[in-house]
């Protein structure tokens, strides 16, 4: 009879994480008598996976009844495969002996690779808000995938971005891998409703990539533009001055009126109107009693937006006497002139 050969027909197999892996092994002879053992890896540091003779291997089941003398199929099935199970598995025939069994012949090995899905990409933006025209960085991370080959793309509102850098770690062989990418995005005033998307494609996803998103509303700060205007006279000796606060984001805003540098009123923005682009408008008005002033009045609308240093716009009221018009219930008030903003 020809000498026993150990046949592992599969040079490599690929299994999805969570599934079972069947490792095939047959022998060509029933002699010599002795057990089969399965190992992961070769050499002195090899890891015992299954021993026909003894031991408890809860994740391993045999395809055939290995207790029988006439069995020549020593295939095993390993359940609930994880990336940590990747490696080369050897089916090894031992000859019965003492004090230890003697290794007789090994199969050529079967390389088990584990297909593991990447985790859902997590996109994070800068810690602090930034204003339009500034460049901000977004990071995207995904972990636990195998094999190493992976594709990552960035999009802003559906348009692919090109300014990004991606690393897959570790560089060498590993049971699983992680990807880290940083993209640079230039903010515009219209970005309140914008989204940045990180898209990850991997063999395990069967053409249906994973996406992580970040809303630029969490990142952008659009500072307001201020316009102070004087309205027609409301009543005798009273002038209505409005401060239009336009196109700002986020909502958090506090407005202070100053008369000749003295605080007249402070209010927090409420009842905002939202623009199509996601920014907000707000208007505050101030009734100025002109008769209480002998000199010209400098009115200042001072706005503190989202904790940033205040911005302001001023308006000069010229105080001068005008004769009353006949039949008029309201005095025309002082002559008013708009001054250039400070």
């Amino acid at each position: 009879e020809e000498e026993l050969q150990v046949i592992q027909p599969d040079k490599s197999i690929s299994v999805a994480a969570g599934e079972s892996a069947t490792l095939h092994c047959t022998v060509t002879s029933l002699i010599p008598v002795g057990p089969i053992q399965w190992f992961r890896g070769a050499g002195p540091g090899r890891e015992l996976i299954y021993n026909q003779k003894e031991g408890h291997f809860p994740r391993v089941t045999t395809v055939s009844d290995l207790t029988k003398r006439n069995n020549m199929d020593f295939s095993i099935r390993i359940s609930n495969i994880t990336p940590a199970d990747a490696g080369t598995y050897y089916c090894v025939k031992f000859r019965k002996g003492s004090p230890d069994d003697v290794e007789f012949k090994s199969g050529a090995g079967t390389e088990l690779s584990v297909r593991a899905k990447p985790s859902a990409p997590v996109v994070s933006g800068p810690a602090a808000r930034a204003t339009p025209q500034h460049t901000v960085s977004f990071t995207c991370e995904s972990h636990g995938f195998s094999p190493r080959d992976i594709t990552l793309k960035w999009f802003k509102n559906g348009n692919e971005l090109s300014d990004f850098q991606t690393n897959v770690d570790p560089a060498g062989d590993s049971v699983s891998y992680s990807i880290h990418s940083t993209a640079k995005v230039v903010l515009t005033r219209e970005d309140v409703h914008s989204q940045v998307i990180c898209e990850v494609a991997h063999v395990t996803l069967q053409g249906d990539p994973l996406r992580g998103t970040a809303n630029l509303s969490e990142t952008i700060r659009v500072p307001p533009t201020l316009e102070v205007t004087q309205q027609p006279v409301r009543a005798e000796n009273q002038v209505n001055v409005t401060c239009q606060v336009r196109k700002f984001y986020p909502q958090r805003l506090q407005l202070t009126w100053l008369e000749n540098g003295n605080v007249s009123r402070t209010e927090t923005a409420s009842t905002l109107t939202e623009n199509k682009d996601g920014t907000y408008n707000w208007m505050s008005w101030l009734l100025v009693n002109v008769s209480a002033h002998r000199d010209d009045v400098k009115l200042t609308c001072q706005v503190e937006h989202d904790g940033q240093p205040a911005v302001s716009k001023s308006h000069d009221l010229k105080v001068s006497a005008h004769p009353k018009e006949q039949g008029s219930n309201t005095a025309p008030g002082p002559a008013l002139a708009s001054a250039a903003p400070l």
Epitope: E1, S29, L30, I31, V33, G34, P35, Q52, K53, E54, L66, T67, K68, R69, N70, N71, K96, G97, S98, P99, D100, D101
Partner: antibody
Framework: EVQLVESGGGLVQPGGSLRLSCAAS????????MHWVRQATGKGLEWVSV???????YYPGSVKGRFTISRENAKNSLYLQMNSLRVGDTAVYYC????????????WGQGTMVTVSS | DIQMTQSPSSLSASIGDKVTITCRAS??????LAWFQQKPGKAPKSLIY???SLQSGVPSKFSGSGSGTDFTLTISSLQPEDFATYYC?????????FGQGTKLEIK
């Protein structure tokens, strides 16, 4: 049903010969090592011989050169040719299958009695 | 040849008792040790192989342990059908050899 049935035992004079047979059924006979074991009345068990799957044979010193084990796979039969019999060979002879992966005996026949006496 | 020595040669026990029989090999036999049960006028019955593996159909009250040179057979709760003679056997190398037997009798 897996079964082993011995036959061929009997009374024989010292120096005589006897051929024991073991008929196997219920399994693939050719895939198993087969053994003969004997037991003298009131005594313990003694292993007598083995024939492997490939036809290789082994014997203890007590029977070497006198006993020959053989098999006929086509007939699912095991044999033990006993020559130059001695009074000390008197025993019940059992055939046994090395049925476990390690050749541990798992199935035994009911035995056949061999008496060597003048 | 490898010598196998069983102890005790005979043992008296009662129904429900737990009993242990030991077997010692004259040299290391790894764990290639089998245990057999034999009743008067009957063929031996295989109980255990590779020191601790139960043969198919053998009740779990029988258990074996050991490796190297020292081995034990334990019967956890004796029943009337368990009173018999028990043999150990090494089968690591030819010639296979048996212990002299332990006769388990009812007290």
């Amino acid at each position: 049903e897996v079964q082993l049935v011995e036959s061929g035992g009997g009374l024989v004079q010292p120096g005589g010969s006897l051929r024991l047979s073991c008929a196997a059924s219920g399994f693939t006979f050719s895939s198993y090592d087969m053994h003969w074991v004997r037991q003298a009345t009131g005594k313990g068990l003694e292993w007598v011989s083995v024939i492997g799957i490939a036809g290789d044979t082994y014997y203890p010193g007590s029977v070497k050169g006198r006993f020959t084990i053989s098999r006929e796979n086509a007939k699912n039969s095991l044999y033990l040719q006993m020559n130059s019999l001695r009074v000390g060979d008197t025993a019940v002879y059992y055939c046994a299958r090395g049925g476990s992966w390690d050749d541990a005996f798992d199935i035994w026949g009911q035995g056949t009695m061999v008496t060597v006496s003048s | 040849d490898i010598q196998m020595t069983q102890s005790p040669s005979s043992l008296s026990a009662s129904i429900g008792d737990k009993v242990t029989i030991t077997c010692r090999a004259s040299q290391d036999i790894n764990n290639y040790l089998a245990w057999f049960q034999q009743k008067p006028g009957k063929a031996p019955k295989s109980l255990i192989y590779t020191a601790s593996s139960l043969q198919s159909g053998v009740p779990s009250k029988f258990s074996g342990s050991g490796s190297g040179t020292d081995f034990t057979l334990t019967i956890s709760s004796l029943q009337p059908e368990d009173f018999a003679t028990y043999y150990c056997q090494q089968y690591v190398s030819y010639p296979y050899t048996f212990g002299q037997g332990t006769k388990l009798e009812i007290k």
